[in-house]
């Protein structure tokens, strides 16, 4: 799905509704772990105002948190601004409002700099039908399969979802 | 090894527009990501945008809007359009070959620079 890195045809409010994340991939594998920073779950998403609301589940001291996200946007069309442990640069990878999402973010945090990719679909019972585009991307973005993390249905915020 | 060579380089005046080009030659470059960085007189080389092989990309904030990085495999070309330019853009700008997104990373190859100059 070369070139398809924007926002998708009918704007941002096709991104609206529910969400479910299937895999995470990282340069640095403690942001994913299990209680790393990034260890989060896409519950919903919203748009306005050409801003991305998000909320999503992170879970803390045994229990998931929902917490809501904005992502601004900026003069780039596929790029948002998120605050969120520190400082991220949003893109949107490929996009396919009906079916999945992938993004990645460019993390700053103090002086330190890595890269997150998030792959999340609509249907979980597809997740696998969208898995190897989400491999391709992490390849070329420079993010290896062993950097991949598949999240599973006995995942602590699966639970949480509804 | 990948050769680089960067050109479009040139003296603009404040609010104008250059196009950057930078030709890879030797090795394929096109399953690589391709850089813009760009080094100020006693400043450190700093970030500037950067596409992959399948033209994702990654700006850093202050030329975001205002620059567009982009690609063609058949060329083996990478460039990077300049717009709304202003006098802090004035560097030298070299294009590299890198493993992916991340500023800095893993770069294999630098090109030798093209000055800008952004001046009333």
């Known amino acids: 799905q070369e070139g398809n890195h924007e926002e998708p045809q009918g704007g941002l409010e096709e991104l609206s509704g529910r969400w479910h994340s299937v895999a995470l991939a990282s340069n640095k594998s403690d942001l994913i772990k299990p209680w790393g920073h990034f260890r989060v779950f896409i519950h919903s998403m919203s748009a306005k105002d050409g801003n991305l609301h998000g909320d999503i589940l992170i879970p803390q001291d045994g229990q998931c948190e929902k917490v809501s996200l904005t992502a601004f946007k900026t003069a780039t069309s596929n790029k948002f601004d998120l605050e969120y442990w520190g400082h991220n640069d949003l893109y949107l990878a490929e996009v396919d409002p009906k079916s999945y999402l992938i993004l990645y973010m460019i993390n700053q945090y103090n002086d330190d700099t890595s890269l997150v990719a998030h792959l999340m679909v609509r249907d979980l019972s597809r997740q696998q039908d969208f898995l190897p585009a989400f491999e391709s991307v992490c390849e070329d973005i420079g993010l290896h399969k062993d950097q991949i993390v598949v999240l599973s249905d006995d995942d602590r915020c699966q639970g949480s979802r509804d | 090894a990948v050769q680089l060579v960067e050109s479009g380089g040139g003296l603009v005046q404040p609010g104008g527009s250059l196009r950057l080009s930078c030709v890879a030659s030797?090795?394929?470059?096109?399953?690589?990501?391709m850089g813009w960085y760009r080094q100020a007189p006693g400043n450190e080389r700093e970030f500037v945008a950067v596409?992959?092989?399948?033209?994702?990309?990654h700006y850093a904030n202050s030329v975001s809007g205002r620059f567009t990085i982009s690609r063609d495999h058949a060329k083996d070309t990478a460039y990077l359009q300049m717009n709304s330019l202003k006098p802090e853009d004035t560097a030298v700008y070299y294009c590299n070959t890198q493993a992916g997104l991340l500023p800095f990373m893993t770069v294999y190859d630098w090109g030798t620079g093209t000055q800008v100059t952004v001046s009333s």
């Open positions: 030797g090795s394929s470059s096109r399953n690589y990501a």
């Open positions: 596409i992959t092989s399948r033209g994702y990309t």
